[in-house]
Amino acid sequence: CHHWLCHCSNRVFLCQDSKVTEIPPDLPRNAIELRFVLTKLRVIPKGSFSGFGDLEKIEISQNDVLEVIEADVFSNLPNLHEIRIEKANNLLYINPEAFQNLPSLRYLLISNTGIKHLPAFHKIQSLQKVLLDIQDNINIHIIARNSFMGLSFESVILWLNKNGIQEIHNCAFNGTQLDELNLSDNNNLEELPDDVFQGASGPVVLDISRTKVYSLPNHGLENLKKLRARSTYRLKKLPSLDKFVMLIEASLTYPSHCCAFANWRRQTSELHPICNKSISRQDIDDMTQPGDQRVSLVDDEPSYGKGSDMLYSEFDYDLCNEFVDVTCSPKPDAFNPCEDIMGYNILR
């Protein structure tokens, strides 16, 4: 483990400071990590890392003269699971062919760069769950259709916060299993079109905090479990609650929006088919005490949870509960009540 220009320990190579003006061609091919920090690299040329079969991580950080990443830079690296490209304000261009065939990729960070367009991810084809972390790229204005198709065969988390995103096209997330989508702090983002999630499964978590989004899409919210829309002042109304089949947590801007969830009943069609198998809707209604938010069975039932009573053994009370317990904030209070404020004598 030795190199004339780059520091090294246990197959980790750190090429650091202004003396590094190009990727050294003689870096050992058995390296497991490469870090290029505070260098004067202007270009990362085609095939810079070819042959690094053991490579697991690449970091390219604080390179203030870096302008271009060429094709085939992150390509055919079977063990590469982490790429970090950050703090390169003059990086304006990442070749569409830069990322290819990275079956082990789990984390890709691109932050504080000058790029104007999302790189092409369609040839990455990871076999792992991927966290794509794209932040603080103020020149990225548009998320085009199919932007993330081919990124992973597994589910993905997309952190697209603090960019300059102004426009997201229909089918932008087509082909993805979207566990989480964070669009927060894109201050000029106004619209999520109705078909933005067309072809995607998810998102399960959606964050549009501190954007100018004024409406949520009418389609694609079926899997949404957590919605975050803090300081999203233009979001004055939510879609019909029957769009939120799976919602369990909402962090919103206006307390009045939480009122909608207070006494919300799921539609019959939204209950799982198993709910009709062991116990009837009427039985549930009978067991529901007035004012209760949850179905509660008698506490002294000795066989509950033990599986010996077939009446209850296959029954999932959360799944089949027609009342939805959504944790919502900010909670309504005396100054932001759910009722018409004229109903309060003291205020009237």
Epitope: C8, N10, L14
Partner: antibody
Amino acid sequence: QVNLKESGPGILQPSQTLNLTCSFSGFSLSTSGMGVGWIRQPSGKGLDWLAHIWWDDDKRYNPALKSRLTISKDASSNQVFLKIASVVTADTATYYCVQINYGNYRFDNWGHGTTLTVSS
Amino acid sequence: DIVLTQSPASLAVSLGQRATISCRASESVDNYGISFLNWFQQKPGQPPKLLIYAASNQRSGVPARFSGSGSGTDFSLNIHPMEEDDTAMYFCQQSKEVPWTFGGGTKVEIK
């Protein structure tokens, strides 16, 4: 095979200027990644890094002595020089010339040292 | 400046046994995953000789009985099995930041 050899005056009086020369072979200071430095060791004591110079003429000094130190090189003749102004008795030590590899800042090869005594 | 404190100041070890020298830095000498900590051996009348660089990497030609470990602020040099020829002073040195500094040294001898 790398060799480094230090030469100096041996004895100086306080306030005089120390001029040290390191003559080396087996590598070139024109080669990227190469550097030469100076380290001193008072008799029976620890080691103090003084200064070094890289192939690209980039120089680094120990801040505690910076005002008195000057390092320079003549790559064509494979020599590095260190000047220490206004010596005092505390400068009495063995002075080593060292080949430094930029990768890991490794002190790869050392000269045998030259002894300086500062005495009035 | 980064201060390196070595302990013990001296150490007597039986032949074939393990000698362990500690080096503690006043602040971390790690940078982007690499520890800029080296170990030197110095015998009387000779210049120091590099044994270990970047905390745990053995310089070529150095016997395998010398090994280094640690990260951040705490490092150690192990000699095992101890041989007669290993009687010497051992110094740690950091090159994370200027001024590059050395530990005060540990004298190792045969018991």
